[in-house]
């Protein structure tokens, strides 16, 4: 169909903020559960600890986590799981000070990736019981379909 | 031509990951050589330590480098060279801990810039023999034509 | 109207760099005054310490500040003020080393948000007399209309 000026710019977008973060007893990771704060389009679906891709294509993904932890290095890994395999897309790593009063760092990263229909995107902190700040302006996750 | 729904969203994109990193003997810099991990469109061409702009326009550029170095500050400079001059577009700077076990930081930055046909974009670390982690999900470079 | 290939890609963009940074005597904040370095479209207007949204919609916002300060944590808050209320959109936080020679960090963050006509966007450093580096490639602010 011919595009109007208004239709032209409608990139699907999804900006998510945390509901909570949990660690499984048997694994050295902390996962974040997400809820939409801004959504445009139907190609992305938050579900529990992941985001399901319903509309394949090239996306700008971004992730920030706000850490309050004296563990010497902290960070997050953004991965996609689909077609029977898991792939790390990008990660963010931050050295943390050893003093609790100073141990406060946000870690932001982003990139452009091809995502497939049915992929599940997740943000993993490879630390059990990681001390995160779940403020919606400190920890968030986002997608823009390009 | 009238745009179809499919044509509408085809931003040219290029996401690059490292092949290697080298230092010249006579200069206090480390340069990264790049290879495409994701490409859409023909307006950008990886060539050695740079990316050649074949299609002028406004681009979102992003850069991340993962440092494993105890030098007190590390970071990267994203520059364009063209029309006989070099221009720094943006830079990322990260203070590093002095203990090798803690000296692990990614540095991400990005911005929107007008790039000219023939420009060569490069990522320079202003340190000879900088200790980088060249994992493709830790160190990368990207472009989105807007 | 039918879009030509050229019209298709014209996202409004604005990339701003600092003019100066000041602290009000009676408040524990430092504000940055901005000037455009790159502008495409008319939907955004730099005015003093803020950016006025003239064209409502969904925007990718990004902010980087380069800190040269030994205060234990530094960072910036990106907020919008409009319709009689203020809302924090996102923030960046960086722990700083206590030694002045090492106290050098850029802090970058970004996200996608719906901005309303008349909103004023600002970058606040919640520290009086924060020591910032106002280099245009170290401290900047940007918008892309999606």
């Amino acid at each position: 169909a011919v595009l109007t000026q208004k239709q032209k710019k409608q990139h699907s977008v999804l900006h998510l903020v945390p509901i909570n973060a949990t660690s499984k007893d048997d694994s050295d990771v902390t996962e974040v559960m997400w809820q939409p704060a801004l959504r445009r389009g139907r190609g992305l679906q938050a579900q529990g600890y992941g985001v399901r891709i319903q509309d394949a294509g090239v996306y700008l993904l971004y992730s920030q986590v706000l850490f309050q932890d004296v563990t010497f290095t902290m960070g997050q890994v953004v991965s996609r799981e689909g077609q029977g395999r898991q792939e790390t897309l990008f990660r963010c790593i931050r050295s943390m000070p050893s003093h609790p009063d100073r141990a406060y760092n946000s870690c932001y990263s982003a990139g452009v990736f091809h995502l497939h229909q049915g992929d599940i995107l997740s943000v993993i902190i490879p630390r059990a019981r990681a001390k995160l700040n779940l403020s919606p302006h400190g920890t968030f996750l986002g997608f823009v379909k390009l | 031509a009238v745009l179809t729904q499919k044509q509408k969203k085809q931003h040219s994109v290029l996401h690059l990951v490292p092949i290697n990193a080298t230092s010249k003997d006579d200069s206090d810099v480390t340069e990264v050589m790049w290879q495409p991990a994701l490409r859409r469109g023909r307006g950008l061409q990886a060539q050695g330590y740079g990316v050649r702009i074949q299609d002028a326009g406004v681009y979102l550029l992003y850069s991340q480098v993962l440092f494993q170095d105890v030098t007190f500050t590390m970071g990267q400079v994203v520059s364009r060279e063209g029309q006989g001059r070099q221009e720094t577009l943006f830079r990322c700077i990260r203070s590093m801990p002095s203990h090798p076990d803690r000296a692990y930081n990614s540095c991400y930055s990005a911005g929107v810039f007008h790039l000219h046909q023939g420009d060569i974009l490069s990522v320079i670390i202003p340190r000879a023999r900088a200790k980088l982690n060249l994992s493709p999900h830790g160190t990368f470079l990207g472009f989105v034509k807007l | 109207a039918v879009l030509t290939q050229k019209q298709k890609k014209q996202h409004s963009v604005l990339h701003l760099v600092p003019i100066n940074a000041t602290s009000k005597d009676d408040s524990d904040v430092t504000e940055v005054m901005w000037q455009p370095a790159l502008r495409r479209g008319r939907g955004l207007q730099a005015q003093g310490y803020g950016v006025r949204i003239q064209d409502a919609g969904v925007y990718l916002l990004y902010s980087q500040v380069l800190f040269q300060d030994v205060t234990f944590t530094m960072g910036q808050v990106v907020s919008r003020e409009g319709q009689g209320r203020q809302e924090t959109l996102f923030r960046c936080i960086r722990s700083m080393p206590s030694h002045p020679d090492r106290a050098y960090n850029s802090c970058y963050s970004a996200g996608v948000f719906h901005l309303h006509q008349g909103d004023i966007l600002s970058v606040i450093i919640p520290r009086a007399r924060a020591k910032l580096n106002l280099s245009p490639h170290g401290t900047f602010l940007g918008f892309v209309k999606l």
Partner: antibody, heavy 121, light 107 residues
């Protein structure tokens, strides 16, 4: 106390080379770069480049590339600047000056006393 | 290269005067500007870095301001020891460049 002590005055013939030394004390030598700046008689200051003792890597002003060599000896906490193919307009006072290790975004906070180099036939 | 243009090149003033020296950069250098004082036969001495930060031990009568392309060094009340040549320098972009200097002399 930070101190930078430079070698003595030199008189050289055109085409020759000169090597100036700068011995640092009072700080960790490898944590700072050493800039070299020159000043022709009655003229302003001109940045020539720096040596980073941490990795013994230089950064040169393009104007001097091919003629200047900057090195360091960490065991002696000493930086060196050698200028070759000397011309009469290289007659100047040559200063070493300390800058922080990231080089950019830091001023030169301590300076040596200067070394006068005279190029004359 | 970035050109740093200082004015005036010579300034005559008296003890107790307030004097201002300006420096204009040919392109935006943020606040990455330093001011140095040099006396005859001596090395330059750092007064101000980051456009406005006084170096340790520098008297409070010296102040710097500006960002972007326009910078000023102000001496609020001239003392006999202040008669010297002053240089601005940008350290935002390689090669680092200096102004041509302002000679402050006794009126």
């Amino acid at each position: 106390e930070v101190q930078l002590v430079q070698s003595g005055a030199e008189v050289k013939k055109p085409g020759a080379s000169v090597k100036v030394s700068c011995k640092a004390s009072g700080y960790t030598f490898t944590s700072y770069v050493m800039h070299w700046v020159r000043q022709a008689p009655g003229q302003g200051l001109e940045w020539m480049g720096y040596i980073n003792p941490y990795n013994d890597a230089p950064k040169y002003n393009e104007k001097f590339k091919g003629r200047v060599t900057m090195t360091s000896d960490t065991s002696a906490s000493t930086a060196y600047m050698e200028l070759s193919s000397l011309r009469s307009d290289d007659t100047a006072v040559y200063y070493c000056a300390r800058g922080l290790g990231y080089a950019l975004y830091y001023a030169m906070d301590y300076w040596g006393q200067g070394t006068t180099v005279t190029v004359s036939s | 290269d970035i050109v740093m243009t200082q004015s005036p090149s010579t300034l005559s003033a008296s003890v107790g005067d307030r004097v201002t020296i300006t420096c204009k950069a040919s392109q935006n250098v943020g606040n990455n500007v330093a001011w140095y004082q040099q006396k005859p036969g001596k090395a330059p001495k750092l007064l101000i870095s980051s456009a406005s930060n006084r170096d340790s031990g520098v008297p409070s009568r010296f102040s710097g301001s500006g960002s972007g392309t326009e910078f000023t060094l102000t001496i609020s009340s001239l003392q006999p020891d202040d008669f010297a040549t002053y240089f601005c320098q940008q350290y935002n972009i390689y090669p680092f460049t200096f102004g041509q200097g302002t000679k402050l002399e006794i009126k």
